[in-house]
């Protein structure tokens, strides 16, 4: 029928390197047409899907997994997959997250800008997702 | 199998007020988006507003003919898609229809109800 | 706000014909469309999405084309239940705006 699924993407928001405590979104890309994204732990036991699907860009879209909260427990591999037109992809590479205090004086408090309000926005007039803030998303218990 | 069915309809004044109601079935309701679009007697489509999941917490979008008037919520437990209607207006007049998402394009609607606002 | 111009606004056919509408959009969207059919009555079904996916069970004589601003939706062979109105809506931005339609009807 049709050629190979082109591979997702995962990145995280602000970075892959977050201190206990504060929030981190996981965000995975696809082409436009996904009808559901799958956020994976290494081992594949553990994942979370989700069918809110947005733009990214004019050809890709988009679904974010947001964790409030980060512990050590969120700390690993993660990758993103899809399904389209009930054909499912290849996995993307694996993101690791690294749950660690950022500042190199662990004593003191982390100092930089609070990021619980979410993501940045992209400049670009945006999609229907708009990019709007998810603070209240899935906790370290919903996604594991 | 999808099922989605609105509720609420009816006559209202200029001025008054009317709650719609969607009830969701044949699918797990809270990782979907989902909006409520609107057609006048004898016109074309318009989409009213949308709601997505608590991933984006919940994030709200409207058309610029209704903002500051409908509040568009969801209820997941119940399962439940909600439409407050304030301030009506004679142009809100049509049948809405609820609608779910899927890949981000209007997938699955319901049977829609009539909003008739006239004095 | 994305204006998507659709044309023509009605047009008649006869069964067995090929039927193109054209949606046009104000900015590009990518393939971010939609086409939708809707009978008198009824609720709008989902034909075609991102722009030339074919949605489930809906038949493959109805085929979509374009990116970026200019988008085609073609019926092959015009069937009797096809005399419909059909609508392009594009999702890449809110407002999330449709096309005024087309009535296609029977000659």
């Known amino acids: 029928q049709e050629g190979p699924l082109p591979r997702p993407s995962i990145s995280a928001e602000p970075g892959t390197v977050i201190p206990p405590g504060r929030p981190v979104t996981i965000v995975c890309r696809g082409p436009v047409g996904v009808d559901q994204f799958r956020l994976e732990r290494e081992d594949r036991s553990k994942f979370n899907d989700t069918k809110d699907v947005s733009q990214a860009s004019p050809s890709e879209s988009e679904a974010r997994f947001r964790i409030d909260s980060v512990s050590e427990g969120n700390a690993g591999h993660y990758r993103c997959l899809y399904v389209k037109s009930t054909r499912w992809s290849e996995h993307s590479d694996y993101l690791d997250l690294v749950v660690k205090e950022t500042s190199g004086d662990t004593d003191s408090p982390v100092t930089e800008p609070d990021s619980s309000a979410g993501p940045t926005q992209r400049p670009s007039d945006n999609s229907h997702n708009e990019h709007a803030p998810a603070s209240q998303g899935l906790s370290a218990e919903h996604l594991y | 199998e999808v099922q989605l069915v609105e509720s609420g309809g009816g006559l209202v004044q200029p001025g008054g007020s009317l709650r719609l109601s969607c009830a969701a079935s044949?699918?797990?309701?809270?990782?979907?988006?989902m909006n409520w679009v609107r057609q006048a007697p004898g016109k074309g489509l318009e989409w009213v507003a949308r709601i997505r999941t608590k991933n984006y917490n919940y994030a709200t979008f409207y058309a610029d003919s209704v903002k500051d008037r409908f509040t568009i919520s969801r209820d997941d437990s119940k399962n439940s898609l909600y439409l407050q209607m304030n301030s009506l207006k004679t142009e809100d007049t049509a049948v809405y229809y609820c609608?779910?998402?899927?890949?981000?394009?209007?997938?699955?609607w319901g049977q829609g109800t009539t909003v008739t606002v006239s004095s | 706000d994305i204006q998507m111009t659709q044309s023509p606004s009605s047009l008649s056919a006869s069964v067995g014909d090929r039927v193109t509408i054209t949606c046009l959009a104000s900015?590009?969207?990518?393939?971010?469309l939609g086409w939708y059919q809707q009978k008198p009555g009824k609720a709008p079904k989902l034909l075609i999405y991102a722009a030339t996916s074919l949605a489930e069970g809906v038949p493959s004589r109805f085929s979509g084309s374009g990116s970026g601003t200019d988008f085609t939706l073609t019926i092959s062979s015009l069937q009797p239940e096809d005399f419909a109105t059909y609508y392009c809506q594009q999702l890449y931005s809110t407002p999330l705006t449709f096309g005024g339609g087309t009535k296609v009807e029977i000659k």
């Open positions: 609608v779910r998402d899927r890949a981000g394009f209007f997938a699955y």
């Open positions: 044949g699918f797990t309701f809270n990782i979907n988006a």
């Open positions: 900015q590009t969207i990518g393939t971010w």
